[in-house]
């Protein structure tokens, strides 16, 4: 025999009692498949945490983040602090990129400015807290009669750290 | 949705060489670092280093610097975890995870086995 | 770089409190984030920047830093909290984390 309890659509859950018929979600509940035996508590977009979708019987609530705060996590499940760019987050707040770093995002960690002499090249435009530094051609490529510049390309040595 | 997928099992023999990969999907893959983390057959995790894809730095734990390569191509997305030369005590699960404190997303993993 | 020195076991009678210890040097000037890890699958966070619960996690799980040790916190175990935990943290010193040894979490009876 076929549990009708399957017949219960979504927004509704199946009672325990013999008839089993199908019950309505209370408030802060939904149930978003069929047959379920219960309702799930709707997600509560609290703190750092707004409210992107409300909760319906059929559907859990969505969260996003306060302004100022990123999503992290699927269907955002955490919110990180925003920094501004050249700046990265530490336990004591958003703190300026050290010299010879930068961070182009809102958020993440500095990382050390390209070096364009690994490459062979010079800097064709100096780096900030923001922005990396443009790498140009070879000093030997700006000589009076060099011939061919090689586009810009970014080197660092593998596993270097800023100090 | 956000994906990390990981190449699958690999059995290699000592002295070989192996890149594994890991595709992100469902986000700016440029922009958010990634970590490769270790975990040894019935041991712990251990961190051995971060790429950030969109312009290839990478930092390296000082436990695995010299033993292996990270490095990506953003344009598919994908980063890599190399060795030019395996050992048996390279037999492990390597994960990638987003991220370079707070990991919020990982792969399935990929199990490498070196026996000869 | 920091070590983080975990207990490699801890037991726990049903509906009593769990608690994991995280040391390291100061670690209580950095984030501690913890993962919870169950067999065959990849470790999932269950708290971040030292006491912030991801939405999903259950409110049994908290989470303390200060000084040398950051603390896991899990009142009310249940027996499917019974899985490896791991501390970690991103040091700006070597700009690397690192792990703890992880503490395997079981539930008697």
């Known amino acids: 025999i076929q549990d009708s309890c399957s017949k219960c659509p979504a927004g509704t859950f199946c009672g325990k009692n013999k008839s089993q018929i199908c019950i309505p979600c209370p408030p802060n509940s939904f149930s978003s498949t069929s047959g379920q035996k219960a309702c799930d508590i709707c997600r509560q977009c609290e703190g750092v945490f707004r409210t992107k979708k409300v909760c319906s019987s059929t559907s859990n609530a969505e969260c996003d983040c306060i302004s100022g705060f990123h999503c992290l996590g699927a269907g955002c499940t955490m919110c990180e602090q925003d920094c501004k760019q050249g700046q990265e987050l530490t336990k004591k707040g958003c703190k300026d990129c050290c010299f010879g770093t930068f961070n182009d995002q809102k958020r993440g960690i500095c990382r050390p400015w390209t070096n364009c002499s690994l490459d062979g090249k010079s800097v064709l435009v100096n780096g900030t807290k923001e922005r990396d530094v443009v790498c140009g051609p070879s000093p030997a490529d700006l000589s009076p009669g060099a011939s061919s510049v090689t586009p810009p390309a970014p080197a660092r040595e593998p596993g270097h750290s800023p100090q | 949705q956000v994906q990390l997928v990981q190449s699958g099992a690999e059995v290699k023999k000592p002295g070989e060489s192996l890149k594994i990969s890991c595709k992100g999907s469902g986000y700016s893959f440029s922009t958010y670092w990634i970590s490769w983390v270790r975990q040894m057959p019935g041991k712990g995790l251990e961190w051995m280093g971060k790429i950030y894809p969109g312009d290839s730095y990478t930092n390296y734990s000082p436990s695995f610097q010299g033993q292996v390569t990270i490095s990506a191509d953003k344009s598919i997305s994908t980063a890599y975890l190399q060795w030019s030369s395996l050992k048996a005590s390279d037999t492990a699960m390597y994960y990638c995870?987003?991220?370079?404190?707070?990991?919020?997303?990982w792969g399935q993993g990929t199990l490498v086995t070196v026996s000869s | 770089d920091i070590e983080l020195t975990q207990p490699p076991s801890v037991s726990v009678a049903p509906g009593q409190t769990a608690r994991i210890s995280c040391s390291g040097d100061?670690?209580?000037?950095?984030?501690a984030h913890w993962y919870q890890q169950k067999p065959g699958q990849a470790p999932v966070v269950v708290i971040y920047q030292d006491k912030n619960r991801p939405s999903g996690i259950p409110e049994r799980f908290s989470g303390s830093n200060s000084g040398n040790t950051a603390t896991l916190t899990i009142s009310g175990t249940q027996a499917e909290d019974e899985a490896d935990y791991y501390c970690?943290?991103?040091?700006?010193?070597?700009?690397?984390?690192?792990f703890g040894g992880g503490t395997k979490l079981t539930v008697l009876g």
């Open positions: 970690s943290t991103y040091t700006f010193v070597g700009f690397t984390t690192v």
């Open positions: 100061n670690i209580g000037d950095q984030y």
């Open positions: 995870a987003r991220g370079y404190g707070i990991f919020d997303y």
